[in-house]
Interface confidence: medium
């Protein structure tokens, strides 16, 4: 007997308030079909229905939040319906505060080695997921620690690929409503460097500048980059800048710092669009200093 | 500017179809839903249904079941219903109208097309 | 589905005059899927108020939207020509998202 394929769209973890798409293929292409839920909460918009080709669910409540199967219809089947599809798990966000996730030792990974990505938070979560964006499989289901001050989870990830890198955000939940979720975590960028030959840093007017002085920092390469990326040693984030093909065949970015006040150990990275979490190698660090100010770090 | 531009007025025989569209310019069409209303003369406003045109998922009003079908054509940005087995309780002013949400749960319509006067008669 | 009732049904102002109108739920509705559009004759709705207390662009100020739970109300602090119309209430609280009968409002 056919059984139809569930799907979701745009995924299965769905903020509160918001509309998911619930899909129903049939491979012998009938386009009508009904759905259930298995658990949870009862979704009374779907009792005594059938639905043609998908079906616009929303906005959703806590109470949409568990497991759908469709049954399409079946002309040959006694009862006129198909078996039941896969399960689809429908997990609510928003229903909890947030959890924060980090990565150690630090978001920028070489390729070959391992991350840990922490999730924590002050609420007790049982449970939390990981959620790669852009991903429509089900995220990483984890098993939280609890502790006086709330809960963690550790999850170790590698040897790191560019399969791997991606924007990540976790959740918590508790083990009675497995489905609804904490809101997301703020994202953050996993980045897999050493996929290309390292790019060099220059600074103008030169690495030593005195207090209030603009420096620009340039990061060229002979490799066809289309953005260059500055980080600054101990500090979170990067600047981000479009490569320009220069006429002696580098493409370089020129990054100006404005009027610096204390000093610091820069690094430049290359990526190309296609792969924006894929880095090169790092420059060689440059250090620029700041005379005239005891913040020369 | 952002516009929903309705098909003009249709005049049909009972039993028949009609198909009214609503053409969307000034945002990107894929990002919001459409939703459609009907009004009959003199009296108020009632939810047939909503689209989502990234998707082509679609969610309907019960009493509207079996009478619109809501499809969506992303590369002309024009939503479309067609109204099957009309009767005289069809006739109607039919209006699309944009889907949008304030914050993440604050959904209201915001955008409305100018209207499309479906009359059945014999 | 959620059932919005407004009242009066219609209703006439003097110039200058303030006005309000009500919108009862049958269930409870978050005040932020609470909205109401203003429609005027051979024209669609226009989108007024969101959220219970949101002007939408272009709205003036003498409107103005509260209330919570169940019941809902849409004030204007001093009635013009041009506020004569119909208002809806609406929700989206719940699918599938329902209006209120509507209030007309005239001029005395």
């Known amino acids: 007997q056919d059984k139809p394929f569930l799907s979701a769209w745009p995924g299965t973890v769905v903020s509160e308030g918001q509309h998911v798409t619930l899909q129903c293929r049939s491979r012998l292409g009938f386009n009508e079909f009904s759905l259930s839920k298995e658990d949870g909460m009862p979704v009374p918009e779907l009792y005594n229905r059938i639905f043609r080709n998908s079906f616009l669910m929303g906005p959703v409540t806590p109470a949409h939040a568990g497991t759908y199967r469709c049954c399409s219809s079946h002309p040959h089947s006694p009862t006129g319906w198909s078996a039941p599809s896969n399960p689809v798990v429908i997990m609510v966000t928003g229903v909890h505060r947030k959890p924060s996730l980090l990565a150690h030792p630090g978001p920028l990974v070489k390729s070959g080695e391992t991350v840990i990505l922490q999730c924590w938070s002050d609420v007790r979560f049982e449970r939390f997921l990981l959620h790669r964006e852009g991903i429509t499989e089900d995220p990483l289901r984890l098993v939280g620690q609890l502790h006086d001050a709330g809960s963690q989870v550790n999850y170790s990830m590698g040897p790191m690929t560019p399969a791997l890198a991606g924007t990540y955000r976790c959740f918590g939940s508790v083990t009675h409503l497995p489905y609804e979720l904490s809101a997301p975590s703020d994202p953050l960028d996993i980045v897999v460097v050493g996929l290309y030959g390292k790019p060099s840093l220059s600074a103008q007017p030169g690495p030593t500048v005195q207090a209030g002085e603009n420096v620009t920092l340039s990061c060229s390469s002979r490799s066809l980059f289309d953005i260059y990326h500055l980080s600054r040693e101990a500090e979170a984030g990067e600047l981000r800048l479009t490569a320009v093909l220069r006429v002696n065949g580098t493409f370089q970015a020129n990054f100006p710092l404005g009027p610096v006040t204390h000093g610091g150990n820069y690094r430049c990275f290359g990526s190309f669009r296609a792969l924006p979490h894929a880095w090169s190698d790092p420059s060689d660090p440059l250090p620029v200093s700041v005379t005239g100010n005891s913040r020369n770090l | 500017k952002v516009q929903l531009q309705q098909s003009g007025a249709e005049l049909v025989r009972p039993g028949t179809s009609v198909k009214v569209s609503c053409k969307a310019s000034g945002y990107a069409f894929t990002n919001y839903l459409i939703e459609w209303v009907k009004q009959r003369p003199g009296q108020g406003l009632e939810w047939i249904g909503v689209i989502n045109p990234g998707s082509g998922g679609t969610n309907d009003n019960e009493k509207f079941r079996d009478k619109a079908t809501l499809t969506a054509d992303k590369s002309s940005s024009t939503a479309y219903m067609q109204l099957s087995s009309l009767t005289s309780d069809d006739s109607a002013v039919y209006f699309c109208?944009?889907?949008?949400?304030?914050?993440?749960?604050?959904?209201?319509?915001?955008?409305w097309g100018a209207g499309t006067t479906v009359t059945v008669s014999s | 589905q959620i059932v919005l009732t407004q009242s009066p049904a219609i209703m006439s102002a003097s110039l200058g005059e303030r006005v309000t109108m009500t919108c009862t739920a049958s269930a409870s509705v978050s005040s932020s899927s609470l909205h109401w559009y203003q429609q005027k004759p051979g024209s669609p709705p226009k989108f007024w108020i969101y959220s219970t207390t949101n002007l939408a662009s272009g709205v003036p100020t003498r409107f103005s939207g509260s209330g919570s739970g169940t019941s809902y109300s849409l004030t204007i602090s001093n009635m013009e020509a041009e506020d004569a119309a119909t208002y809806y209430c609406?929700?989206?609280?719940?699918?599938?998202?329902?209006f209120g009968g509507g209030t007309k409002l005239e001029i005395k």
């Open positions: 109208a944009r889907g949008n949400y304030y914050g993440t749960t604050d959904w209201y319509f915001d955008v």
């Open positions: 609406h929700q989206y609280h719940r699918s599938p998202p329902t």
